[in-house]
C-alpha cells in the first residue's frame, strides 16, 4: 500500500524558519503534490504549495520556497514573520497524486519537544496514514 510521510523541522539557525519535508513511498510516478496547512482541529486549512513535475511549482505565503528533493519527495521552506511561533500548533498536510493510480495524504506537525538550541535534529520519524 502506498504511503506518505511528513516531517516538520524548525531551523536551528533561524527560529522563524521552518521546513516541511514530504515523501511518497510506493510505485508509480508522481503527477502532483499539494501541501496545505491549518489548525490542529483540522479546520480552516488552506494551500501552501502545489508542485507539478512538468508545469513547475506555485506557492503562497508564508511559503518561501517549494522544491523537489527527489522524484518522490519535496521540501517546503516557511518563513514566520510573527514574533512568536504560530507554526508550533499547526498541522501540515501533503497529498501526493499518482495518476491514474490514485492519491494519498498524510499530515504532521512540529514535534512539541522541538528545541533548536539542542543538538542536531533527530532522525525523521515518518508519520504515515494509509486509508
Amino acid at each position: 500500500t502506498p504511503e506518505v510521510w511528513v516531517q516538520v523541522q524548525m531551523e536551528a539557525t533561524e527560529l522563524s524558519s521552518f521546513t516541511v519535508h514530504c515523501g511518497f513511498l510506493g510505485p508509480g510516478s508522481i503527477s502532483l503534490v499539494t501541501v496545505s496547512w491549518g489548525g490542529p482541529d483540522g479546520a480552516g486549512g488552506t494551500k501552501l504549495a502545489v508542485l507539478h513535475p512538468e508545469l513547475g511549482t506555485r506557492q503562497w505565503a508564508p511559503a518561501r520556497q517549494a522544491r523537489w528533493e527527489t522524484q518522490s519527495s519535496i521540501s517546503l521552506a516557511l518563513e514566520d514573520s510573527g514574533a512568536s511561533s504560530p507554526f508550533a500548533n499547526t498541522t501540515f498536510c501533503c497529498k501526493f497524486a499518482s495518476f491514474p493510480e490514485g492519491s494519498w495524504e498524510s499530515c504532521g506537525s512540529l514535534p512539541p519537544s522541538s528545541d533548536p538550541g539542542l543538538s542536531a535534529p533527530p532522525t525523521p520519524v515518518p508519520i504515515l496514514r494509509a486509508d
Partner: nanobody
C-alpha cells in the same frame, strides 16, 4: 487512499435542475480547494467551477454563470454543484476534483493535473 465519489447525475429535460454531490474521504477535505470539471461526449475536459477551502471564494466558467452554484460542507466532507436551467450543451460526465486549474493557467485540462479525482457522474440534458 483518497476517495472522491460523485452522485446525482441522470437524465433531465432542458430547463430542469440537478444537484451533484461528491463525497470525499481519506484526506483533510477542509484544507483543499475543490473543483468540478466536465467532459462532453467526444470533447476534451472543461473546467466548470472552483471553490476554495473555506468556501469564501468561488469561480465559474462563463457558460454556467448564473445557472450553476458550487458549494461545500466541510463538516460532511462533501462538495456540491447545483445546476439549474440546464441546456443540451451541459450534457457531459461531471468529475469532482481536488485543486484549482488556474494554479498553472492550464488551457488544455487533464485529470492528471489535479490532486485527486472521482470516477464521474453522467448528466444528460435531453427532451
Amino acid at each position: 487512499e483518497v476517495q472522491l465519489v460523485e452522485s446525482g447525475g441522470g437524465l433531465v429535460q432542458p430547463g430542469g435542475s440537478l444537484r451533484l454531490s461528491c463525497a470525499a474521504s481519506g484526506f483533510t477535505f477542509s484544507y483543499y480547494d475543490m473543483s468540478w470539471v466536465r467532459q462532453a461526449p467526444g470533447k476534451g475536459l472543461e473546467w466548470v467551477s472552483t471553490i476554495n477551502s473555506n468556501a469564501g471564494r468561488t469561480s465559474y466558467v462563463d457558460s454556467v454563470k448564473g445557472r450553476f452554484t458550487i458549494s461545500r460542507d466541510n463538516t460532511k466532507n462533501t462538495l456540491y454543484l447545483q445546476m439549474n436551467s440546464l441546456r443540451a450543451e451541459d450534457t457531459a460526465v461531471y468529475y469532482c476534483v481536488e485543486g484549482d486549474p488556474h494554479n498553472f493557467g492550464l488551457e488544455s485540462l487533464s485529470l492528471r493535473d489535479f490532486g485527486s479525482w472521482g470516477q464521474g457522474t453522467m448528466v444528460t440534458v435531453s427532451s
